[in-house]
Interface confidence: low
């Protein structure tokens, strides 16, 4: 006959480990007893349990309440045991010794491997701003046994660097994702992916990128200067920009206060029926926490009663 066991039994922390030991005997052979012991090198063999065909299961005090026989139906030639609630300290070598009649004794060893699934954490880097060089976007750390794998899943171009710290029974892996911030990255997901044999599926933590920027400002509304004539209704100027965080807008007149009747509505400056009093230099001031931009335009309101035509100047400044 021979013993059937596994070279390695792998179990996740806190779960029950089945330590297999099955005697494949010839017809008529019987198993008298099965002894299980911890057999790590450098330590004396530590008894776990004794399964006796007549007297049943005896568990040594150190493993009281933790070692059981698998539930029935059980084959009398099966000496497998269940080690309840595996902890990291249970990792190591185990020996199964089977006493049979009439064939004698057999022994086999297996290694119990206790997987400690990681609990990953993701830490965003410093605030990202357009114009920075290579900057840390986020770091992701996971500790487990064996060492977990930490990778990144994203459409964003960047570079990764990993480092690992070994502890007595586990390893921590940290991976950093660096990028050159640009406005196109705004709202893009950056996902840390942690793989480990103790996980049924990869763990994923997603961070949404926020890159601060402020686009150049420009003013629309003066494209056709002939529309800006005395008496025209509904004339307006609109300030165009975009940013993250979203910018606020402020309108001023460079050569004096805003004329009476001129309305400021966020990015839009609305005029009452035009008079020559509305001629002047108007400035749109755009700002967010990251930066500020200015754009100015010169408005010339044409008076049909005057022969001389006037020019419209458009100036943009940062």
């Amino acid at each position: 006959g021979e013993l059937e066991t596994s070279d390695v039994v792998t179990v996740v922390l806190g779960q029950d480990a089945k330590l297999p030991c099955f005697y494949r005997g010839d017809s008529g052979e019987q198993v008298g007893q099965v002894a299980w012991a911890r057999a790590d090198a450098g330590e004396g063999a530590q008894e776990l349990a004794l399964l006796h065909s007549k007297y049943g299961l005896h568990v040594s005090p150190a493993y009281e309440g933790r070692v059981e026989q698998p539930p029935p139906p059980r084959n009398p030639l099966d000496g497998s045991v269940l080690l309840r609630n595996a902890v990291q300290a249970d990792e190591g070598e185990y020996e199964c010794r089977v006493s049979t009649f009439p064939a004698g004794s057999f022994q086999a060893r297996l290694r119990l491997r206790v997987l400690v699934p990681p609990l990953p954490s993701l830490n965003p880097g410093p605030a990202l701003e357009e114009g920075q060089g290579l900057t840390l976007a986020a770091s992701c750390t996971a500790e487990g046994s064996p060492a977990p794998s930490v990778t990144w899943d994203t459409e964003v171009k960047g570079t990764t660097s990993s480092r690992s710290f070994k502890h007595s029974r586990s390893a921590a892996v940290t991976s950093e994702f660096h990028l050159v911030p640009s406005r196109s990255m705004n709202g893009q997901p950056l996902t840390c992916v942690v793989s480990h044999p103790g996980l049924l599926q990869d763990q994923r933590i997603t961070h949404i990128l926020h890159v601060s920027f402020l686009a150049e400002a420009s003013v629309r509304g003066l494209e056709d200067q002939n529309l800006w004539h005395v008496g025209r209704e509904g004339a307006m100027l609109k300030c165009l920009s975009e940013g993250q965080p979203p910018p606020s807008y402020n309108w001023t007149r460079l050569d004096g206060p805003l004329p009476s009747g001129v309305r400021v509505d966020g990015d839009t400056l609305g005029f009452p029926p035009l008079t020559t009093e509305h001629s002047g230099i108007y400035v749109c001031h755009v700002s967010n926490e990251f930066s500020s931009r200015d754009s100015q335009v010169t408005v010339d309101v044409l008076d049909p009663q005057e022969d001389s035509g006037k020019q419209v100047d458009l100036v943009s400044a940062s």
Partner: antibody
Framework: QVQLVQSGSELKKPGASVKVSCKAS????????IHWVRQAPGQGLEWIGW????????KYNERFKGRVTITADKSTNTAYMELSSLRSEDTAVYYC??????????WGQGTSVTVSS | DIQMTQSPSTLSASVGDRVTITCRAS??????VAWYQQKPGKAPKLLMY???NRFTGVPDRFSGSGYGTDFTLTISSLQAEDLAIYFC?????????FGQGTKLEIK
């Protein structure tokens, strides 16, 4: 090769008993468990109980206790399942299966039992 | 009793598709789970045991995984002959219980 051959179909009246046989060949009969499992028409599988012919130990599903008896004859390598006090809901195909040591690896072809007045 | 809940109850897929059937136990059953295939009018046949071990003669397109309460049977490339009902079963504690079955249909 391992084979489990079951007895033929049965038609029974409510309140009667039925005894289904399962003849094993191709392996050492006394070294493996024999389980009995049933399947009502269009339904799933329901475990009834097992016997270990080596020492004639048995275990039954509580749902059938008192109505089912599983036996084995080592001289003919045959296991039996007897179900008494039959009712219409016992109409099913009854299977025997070998287990080694926890998993049902080979099954009989099934025996149809119909309970009808 | 330990309940075994299978999903989906019916699955329609095409030849060559990757198919996954899941089984959830109402409490931990370690890896003491078997999967069976039953073709119309036939007895069940063992496919996988101890969750991830393929039984003798089972094609390697069948694979199993899981531990504790959640288990999966996967067919990597569906063949026409795989039309059947698939059952999971826990062998951890009596009464041994089966999932309600997943009927696999070929599109």
């Amino acid at each position: 090769q391992v084979q489990l051959v079951q007895s033929g179909s049965e038609l029974k009246k409510p309140g009667a008993s039925v005894k289904v046989s399962c003849k094993a060949s191709g392996y050492t009969f006394t070294s493996y468990y024999i389980h009995w499992v049933r399947q009502a028409p269009g339904q799933g599988l329901e475990w009834i109980g097992w016997i270990y012919p080596g020492n004639v130990n048995t275990k039954y599903n509580e749902r059938f206790k008192g109505r089912v008896t599983i036996t084995a004859d080592k001289s003919t390598n045959t296991a039996y399942m007897e179900l008494s006090s039959l009712r219409s809901e016992d109409t099913a195909v009854y299977y025997c299966a070998r287990s080694n040591p926890y998993v049902m690896d080979y099954w009989g072809q099934g025996t149809s039992v119909t309970v009808s007045s | 009793d330990i309940q075994m809940t299978q999903s989906p109850s019916t699955l329609s897929a095409s030849v060559g598709d990757r198919v996954t059937i899941t089984c959830r136990a109402s409490q931990s059953v370690n890896n003491d789970v078997a999967w069976y295939q039953q073709k119309p009018g036939k007895a069940p046949k063992l496919l996988m045991y101890y969750a991830s071990n393929r039984f003798t003669g089972v094609p390697d397109r069948f694979s199993g995984s899981g531990y504790g309460t959640d288990f999966t049977l996967t067919i990597s490339s569906l063949q026409a002959e795989d039309l059947a009902i698939y059952f999971c079963q826990q062998a951890y504690r009596s009464p041994y219980t089966f999932g309600q079955g997943t009927k696999l249909e070929i599109k």
